[in-house]
């Protein structure tokens, strides 16, 4: 019947050693051995019926024996309950009394055990964990149950095993059996393939900036399997990351800030049982300088009839290595003053009276001038030349 599990697969129970038939030879008349002697080392296999949840004990003998009070058909004792002892009295016409009294120590039901993969997904690329789980209770003494694993040439006598330092993407076969009173009654095999490992490190070929707002990075991909790349670029404390297609070997970075150091990190990753990131390859570059932005909050204030105080705030983006403020003063189209200071604070004295002037303030970063902030202001007539001197407001 299909309901029976083949003993060699899952439910064999046989004491260690093989059956030995003892015979005594007498020259004149051959005498029969006792059945107790003849069947001293009898072995038993247990067959489990998944439908009835009962065992059948198969007696490993060469002839059809009798089983006393227990009926046995074709050397099989039927309807044995798990974890219960049954006594069988074995006799045969080839042997004499006393009969062999065989105690059948029935194991737990096979379905009460399950071989479980306990591998942590994070470590599934280099480790395997297998564990026998008791999924239902039984009354057999658990101290009489032992577990055995064989994985390759390694043998473990544990309920749970952990194999470490394995190769990713490799198949490993583990055979396991459970023994009751040192006799195997179930076994299982598992072939486990370790997960994809972390990809290797990409090899950066070059990484540079040849413009103020752009940079480029090129690389060779790692050897091991991967799904995509992550490219991160960091300026000061700001970090931006991009997901890049696995087929890319070059990426052009756009909209970068001029005269800024960028640190780039590139790693491959694979989405397996979990996402595994490979080691990051690092490089850096500094973008070229560019014109600074306009100074802001420029003010022109009259300090006398023909003197001005010009101030401004630094540009939001300097975009270059140095810091210098320039003030150009024009009357008509003629440049009449051109000053340069470390700070945007200019005292412009001794201008012509009653004259229109244009004041242009801009920032220079050592490489480029910025756009000027322009204000127009006229000087007054010379009030000191008049007899009535007014308060300066």
């Amino acid at each position: 019947s299909d309901a029976y599990l083949n003993a060699s697969e899952t439910t064999t129970l046989s004491p260690s050693g093989s059956a030995v038939i003892s015979t005594t030879t007498i020259a004149t008349t051959p005498s029969k051995p006792t059945c107790d002697e003849k069947y001293a080392n009898i072995t038993v296999d247990y067959l489990y019926n998944k439908e009835t949840k009962l065992f059948t004990a198969k007696l490993n003998v060469n002839e059809n024996v009798e089983c006393g009070n227990n009926t046995c058909t074709n050397n099989e004792v039927h309807n044995l309950t798990e974890c219960k002892n049954a006594s069988v009295s074995i006799s045969h016409n080839s042997c004499t009394a006393p009969d062999k009294t065989l105690i059948l120590d029935v194991p737990p039901g096979v379905e009460k055990f399950q071989l479980h993969d306990c591998t942590q997904v994070e470590k599934a690329d280099t480790t395997i964990c297998l564990k026998w789980k008791n999924i239902e209770t039984f009354t057999c003494d658990t101290q009489n149950i032992t577990y055995r694993f064989q994985c390759g040439n390694m043998i473990f006598d544990n309920k749970e095993i952990k194999l470490e330092n394995l190769e990713p993407e490799h198949e490993y076969k583990c055979d396991s059996e459970i023994l009751y009173n040192n006799h195997k009654f179930t076994n299982a095999s598992k072939i486990i393939k370790t997960d994809f490992g972390s990809p290797g490190e990409p090899q950066i070929i070059f990484c540079r900036s040849e413009a103020a707002h752009q940079g480029v990075i090129t690389w060779n991909p790692p050897q091991r399997s991967f799904h995509n790349f992550t490219l991160c670029y960091i300026k000061e404390t700001e970090k931006d990351c991009l997901n890049l297609d696995k087929n890319l070997i070059k990426y052009d970075l756009q909209n970068l800030k001029p005269y800024t150091k960028y640190v780039l990190s590139l790693h491959a990753y694979i989405i397996a049982k979990v996402q595994r990131n490979g080691s990051a390859a690092m490089c850096h570059f500094t973008t070229k300088s560019a014109p600074p932005s306009q100074v802001w909050n420029m003010t022109v204030s009259m300090t006398s009839d023909n003197s001005m105080h010009v101030k401004c705030r630094p540009p939001r983006d300097r975009n270059g290595p140095h810091e210098r403020y320039h003030l150009e003063v024009e009357a008509g189209n003629t440049l009449v003053r051109n000053e340069s200071h470390k700070n945007c604070d200019f005292r412009v004295k001794d201008l012509q009276y009653s004259t229109d002037y244009t004041f242009k303030a801009y920032f220079h970063n050592g490489d480029y001038p910025g756009e000027p902030f322009i204000l127009h202001h006229s000087t007054s007539y010379n009030s000191k030349a008049h007899h009535h001197h007014h308060h300066h407001h």
């Epitope: 003010t299 204030s301 300066h392």
Partner: nanobody
């Protein structure tokens, strides 16, 4: 305490002219004065400034040659003549008078102004 009140704002076509005035009351009119404006969503910006006797003026580059600031001290009134207006001139225009402690004769810096009007809306349609 000086109070300032602007007049003359309104809706005007691009290319037209408009004259804003600012009446001062409650104090002497012996301060430098100025006009500032603020467009929606933008910061307040300097437009024009004039010293106490009208002898010196200053302008933002965007209005130079189109706008003229003047004052009539006898009437305690400040003016802004706006010619050839464009939609970019649309804003609320504020009149301002210098703070008493200012050491300057004029200034384009709003921090140097201690008195401000409520503002008048100028809208230039294209």
């Amino acid at each position: 305490q000086v109070q300032l009140q602007e007049f003359g704002g309104g809706l005007v076509q691009a290319g037209a002219s408009l004259r804003l005035s600012c009446a001062a009351s409650g104090g002497t009119f012996s301060y430098f004065m100025g006009w500032f404006r603020q467009a929606p969503g933008k910061e307040r910006e300097f437009v024009a400034t004039i010293n106490r006797n009208g002898g010196a003026t200053g302008y933002a580059d965007s209005v130079k040659g189109r706008f003229t600031i003047s004052r009539d001290n006898a009437k305690n009134t400040l003016y802004l003549q706006m010619d050839s207006v464009t939609p970019e001139d649309t804003a609320v225009y504020y009149c301002a008078a210098a703070r008493e402690s200012s050491v300057y004769y004029t200034s384009t810096d709003p921090a140097e102004y201690g008195y401000w009007g409520q503002g008048t809306q100028v809208t230039v349609s294209s």
